[in-house]
Every structure is written in structure tokens, then in C-alpha cells.
């Protein structure tokens, strides 16, 4: 059966701004056939970020990740890092796209919908008008996902390819870098309702994370380049909505003008978009930014949630 | 407004354990990591870990893993470290951060915790 | 790990001084550095962080810059209120570092 290993399905329009190795879980280097090269950058939100391979940021985020990868394997544990090519996966994955990726669809793929459990925070702090799609690049080995502990991943939200609803979709994302403990959509995350006293080596698999707590530490994203603004901490929190693309202060490259083309093989169930809290900061959404990606709402089961005042931005009142 | 408040001090013997707790209002819990941080007398500051509240999943300096277990009780909007097997150098200050989410630092932060262990 | 050394430790100065504290990270933390100010018996406060964005309610007068691994924090004319012990944290990697501190005493 042919995958389009070959075929371009993930190119960038935009390169994001710095983003803290800490928040990110791995990384992917694009096909030769996507012409433009670039790095695909993913956080522990599960939110795909296109990156300049260029720039010494980008050099030294990858080689922390392989570094982390090295010492995953070491430790017994199997880590997939493959370049330059997206298989199909089948397990499902969350994740957002930079505004400036584009996925392609891939020959074949099928698609399952399953409930996303990405950390909120970093959804927190997503706001604007993105639509969720019930497609979403795998995680590497199926391993799951670090989780995301604030609301949003670190990583310049503006930027962001949209975030995606953990359907398996025909893009396979390959990880070099080892998965964080946190919600995934590998793994349901649970959470110690009660303190527990476990050692902290097993207190990770009660948190549901097969792979070494390590790598992207803090998630929550909160607007990059933010002060001690309010965090959200209501029903307009993004709990109560569908992702929507966050334009921060701290990624001022990212605009309007930058926006994510996604072509995805219909899915045969539609995902169910993930609810992450609003993004807040001291930035105004824009609610009239028209969503950017080329595909059909019906055809892909598009989520596209109204996006709250700013006054609802802020991040805790 | 948002609010960190921890547990008072405690005094233990070394080879005890203790529970230090750090209880949050103000925003949506689950939504933001807690960070704690070890401040020795005259020392600076050391970070130790965090955990998510939203899944419950830690993140540990290598330099604390092994007597310290991070975890969360969403119902109460608390979190709480457990330091076992207490020995003199564990001495300190314990505080609970909190901070963004596009990157790791702390702009809430608790009143601390003082930890003093002792025979 | 990133090792963060802060100087001077300590430094003495009078009201309306300007003041500079530098902080050197052992590896490139791509400006994710974040500066605090803590005063006896109390938490840290978050004054500045990506280098050079003040945290909401720091006076202006604070200010930070660098890049690579060489960051400073002045303050442009010191006031009683600033006499405290100031810390840098880096959060480009985990774990998460802080500089030794430096402390500043009033003159």
C-alpha cells in the first residue's frame, strides 16, 4: 500500500520564534520534496510549530532532544527518530499546527476518533479562531505524549499549526526526543486525585507516562513574553471551547498573515476537539481573524469555537 | 486574585518523612504546572521538580528523584511534595511556584515552607 | 544541566545609584533567562523574564539584556525599596537553574 512517503505533506509558510527546549518533546525534519526545508517542532502540548533549521536555537533544541533520546535508549527504552519521512500511523495523537504548517493528505489513512486529553494549559492560552481538525500527526513510537501542564506549550502560539484532535491521521510523526510524563493521546492521563506517597520513579506511571519524565518540563505556555498577567479561570476558560489559535506578545512574527493550509484524508469519525482553558495575556485576540486552512468543515468535522473578549483573555483574574 | 498558601513549618527527625502542601486559588488549577523550588539557609535557589495537576504527572531534577514524590488532589486544588528518609541537609525552605505557559518561570509563588530536621 | 553564575555575590550601594548585576549560564539559554528579587523571609519575586520583558508591576527602572550566555540586570537609580537579594533562573532546559544571587546592601 503506497503512503506518500515520498510526497510533501507537511510544509511551512512561517518559521515560529524561539521556544524553550524545556517544553518540547520532539522534532521532525521535513520531506526534500516539501522544498523548503524545515524543522517540525513539537511541544509537550502536543502543538506543532515549524522551525528554521537555521537558526542556532533550532540547532541546539535538536541536539537536546537527541541527547535526551540517547539516554532514553541507554535507559532501556526504544526511541524512533527518522528524518524526512511521514508514514501513516494509527495511534491516534493530539497535537496543533503552527499557522504555518500544511499537512497533506497521504494516500491512505484511516482515521479513529478519540478523546484528546491535552494538558490545558496549553490551550490556556490559545485564543483567536482556529479550527480543531480530527486529524493530527502521531507521536513518535507510540510512546505517549508529555503532558501539558499549563495551559498551553510553550512555543510561540501565534505560529502554531493548528492543533488537532487525536484522530490517527495519515501523517506519522516521528520523535527524536524522549515523550514527557503528562496527558497524551497515547495514554489516558490519569490524575492522583489524592497525595500519594509513591517514589517518584513510580509516580510517573501513575501518571500514566511510559517514558521518562524528562524534556519538556513546564507546559503551560502562558503567552510568551507575559508578565504576571490574571490567569483565565472560568467558563470562558478554553475548557468550555474548541482550540483556537493564540496570537501572544511574545510571537509578534506570527499574525493574520501567517496561516496553516491543511488538506487531510477525511476521517471516518469525527474527533472530538480537544477543550483546553482560553489563552490569556495582555494580548487582544483577534475574533475576526478568518480561519486559514484549506480543507472542507463538513468533510473533516471542523471544529470553529467563538473566541472570548479579551477582558476573558486574561490569565488569572 | 491568584494564591499559593502553604503548609506551616515542621520540625522532624531525620530519617521521617514530611508533607509539605501547597494549596491554589484563583485560576484553573489543572491548568498550570506547580513548581517547587529549596531555598537552604543562606543558600540559593535549587528547583526540584514539577508537577501537572491536570494528569498528575511529575518532572524531577535528577537531584531529588528517589525520596521526593510530587502529586495533586484536584478536588482540593492542592499540591503537595513528600520529602522521606529526611536527612540534615534537607534543611530548607520549600516553595510552590507557579508560573506561564510559555516557559518556566515563576510569577506566583507560595510564602514557603520552613522544613527543619533535626535529632 | 546549565550552571548560572551570578556576580557580584554581594555589592553595597546608596540610593540613586545605578546598579548592574550580571549572570553567565554555562551554555547558550537563548535570552529564556528571568531575573527575581527576594527580600528576607519571603518568596521570590518575578521582576523580569525572556531577558528583558518586565513582569507586570516591576517599576521601569529595572531593565535586563544579553544574549547567549551573558545576561545583566541593572537597576537604573537604586531605591530604598530595592536593597534585597536578586537571582537569575534560566528555564531554556531542565532542570531549571537559578544563579547564586547577589546580594545588595545599602552603602
Known amino acids: 500500500q503506497h503512503h506518500g512517503v515520498t510526497k510533501c505533506n507537511i510544509t511551512c509558510s512561517k518559521m515560529t520564534s524561539k521556544i524553550p527546549v524545556a517544553l518540547l518533546i520532539h522534532y521532525q525534519q521535513n520531506q526534500a520534496s516539501c522544498g523548503k526545508r524545515a524543522i517540525i517542532l513539537e511541544t509537550r502540548q502536543h502543538r506543532l510549530f515549524c522551525a528554521d533549521p537555521k537558526e542556532q536555537w533550532v540547532k541546539d533544541a535538536m541536539q537536546h532532544l537527541d541527547r535526551q533520546a540517547a539516554a532514553l535508549t541507554r535507559n532501556g527504552g526504544t526511541f524512533e527518530k527518522q528524518i524526512g519521512e511521514v508514514k501513516p500511523r494509527t495511534t491516534p495523537a493530539a497535537g496543533g499546527m503552527d499557522e504555518s504548517v500544511v499537512l497533506e493528505p497521504e494516500a491512505t489513512g484511516e482515521s479513529s476518533s478519540l478523546e484528546p486529553t491535552p494538558s490545558s494549559q496549553e490551550a490556556q492560552r490559545a485564543l483567536g479562531t482556529s479550527p480543531e481538525l480530527p486529524t493530527g500527526v502521531t507521536g513518535s513510537s507510540g510512546t505517549r505524549l508529555p503532558p501539558t501542564p499549563k495551559a498551553q506549550d510553550g512555543g510561540p502560539v501565534g505560529t502554531e499549526l493548528f492543533r488537532v484532535p487525536p484522530v490517527s491521521t495519515a501523517a506519522t510523526w516521528q520523535s527524536s526526543a524522549p515523550h514527557q510524563p503528562g496527558p497524551s493521546l497515547w495514554a489516558e492521563a490519569k490524575t492522583s486525585e489524592a497525595p500519594s506517597t509513591q517514589d517518584p520513579s513510580t509516580q510517573a506511571s501513575t501518571a500514566s507516562s511510559p517514558a521518562p519524565e524528562e524534556n519538556a518540563p513546564s507546559e503551560g505556555q502562558r503567552v510568551w513574553g507575559q508578565g504576571q498577567s490574571p490567569r483565565p479561570e472560568n467558563s470562558l476558560e478554553r475548557e468550555e471551547m474548541g482550540p483556537v489559535p493564540a496570537h501572544t506578545d511574545a510571537f509578534q512574527d506570527w499574525g493574520p498573515g501567517s496561516m496553516a493550509h491543511v488538506s487531510v484524508v477525511p476521517v471516518s469519525s469525527e474527533g472530538t476537539p480537544s477543550r483546553e482553558p482560553v489563552a490569556s495575556g495582555s494580548w487582544t485576540p483577534k475574533a475576526e481573524e478568518p480561519i486559514h486552512a484549506t480543507m472542507d468543515p463538513q468533510r473533516l468535522g471542523v471544529l470553529i469555537t467563538p473566541v472570548p473578549d479579551a477582558q476573558a483573555a486574561t490569565r488569572r483574574q | 486574585q491568584v494564591q499559593l498558601v502553604q503548609s506551616g513549618a515542621e520540625v522532624k527527625k531525620p530519617g521521617a518523612s514530611v508533607k509539605v502542601s501547597c494549596k491554589a486559588s484563583?485560576?484553573?488549577?489543572?491548568?498550570?504546572?506547580i513548581h517547587w523550588v529549596k531555598q537552604a539557609p543562606g543558600q540559593g535557589l535549587e528547583w526540584i521538580g514539577w508537577?501537572?495537576?491536570?494528569?498528575?504527572?511529575?518532572k524531577f531534577n535528577e537531584r531529588f528523584k528517589g525520596r521526593t514524590t510530587l502529586t495533586a488532589d484536584k478536588s482540593t486544588n492542592t499540591a503537595y511534595m513528600l520529602l522521606s528518609s529526611l536527612r540534615s541537609e534537607d534543611t530548607a525552605v520549600y516553595f510552590c511556584?507557579?508560573?506561564?505557559?510559555?516557559?518556566?518561570?515563576?510569577?506566583?509563588w507560595g510564602q514557603g515552607t520552613t522544613v527543619t530536621v533535626s535529632s | 544541566d546549565i550552571q548560572m553564575t551570578q556576580s557580584p555575590s554581594s555589592l553595597s550601594a546608596s540610593v540613586g545609584d545605578r546598579v548592574t548585576i550580571t549572570c553567565r549560564a554555562s551554555?547558550?539559554?537563548?535570552?529564556?533567562l528571568a531575573w527575581y528579587q527576594q527580600k528576607p523571609g519571603k518568596a521570590p519575586k518575578l521582576l523580569i523574564y525572556?531577558?528583558?520583558t518586565l513582569a507586570d508591576g516591576v517599576p521601569s527602572r529595572f531593565s535586563g539584556s544579553g544574549s547567549g550566555t551573558d545576561y545583566t540586570l541593572t537597576i537604573s537609580s537604586l531605591q530604598p525599596e530595592d536593597f534585597a537579594t536578586y537571582f537569575c533562573?534560566?528555564?531554556?532546559?531542565?532542570?531549571?537553574?537559578f544563579g547564586g544571587g547577589t546580594k545588595v546592601e545599602i552603602k
Open positions: 511556584a507557579t508560573g506561564p505557559t510559555d516557559g518556566d518561570y515563576f510569577d506566583y
Open positions: 484563583g485560576y484553573t488549577f489543572t491548568n498550570y504546572y
Open positions: 508537577i501537572y495537576p491536570g494528569d498528575g504527572s511529575p
Open positions: 551554555g547558550n539559554i537563548h535570552n529564556f
Open positions: 525572556n531577558e528583558k
Open positions: 533562573q534560566q528555564f531554556w532546559s531542565t532542570p531549571y537553574t
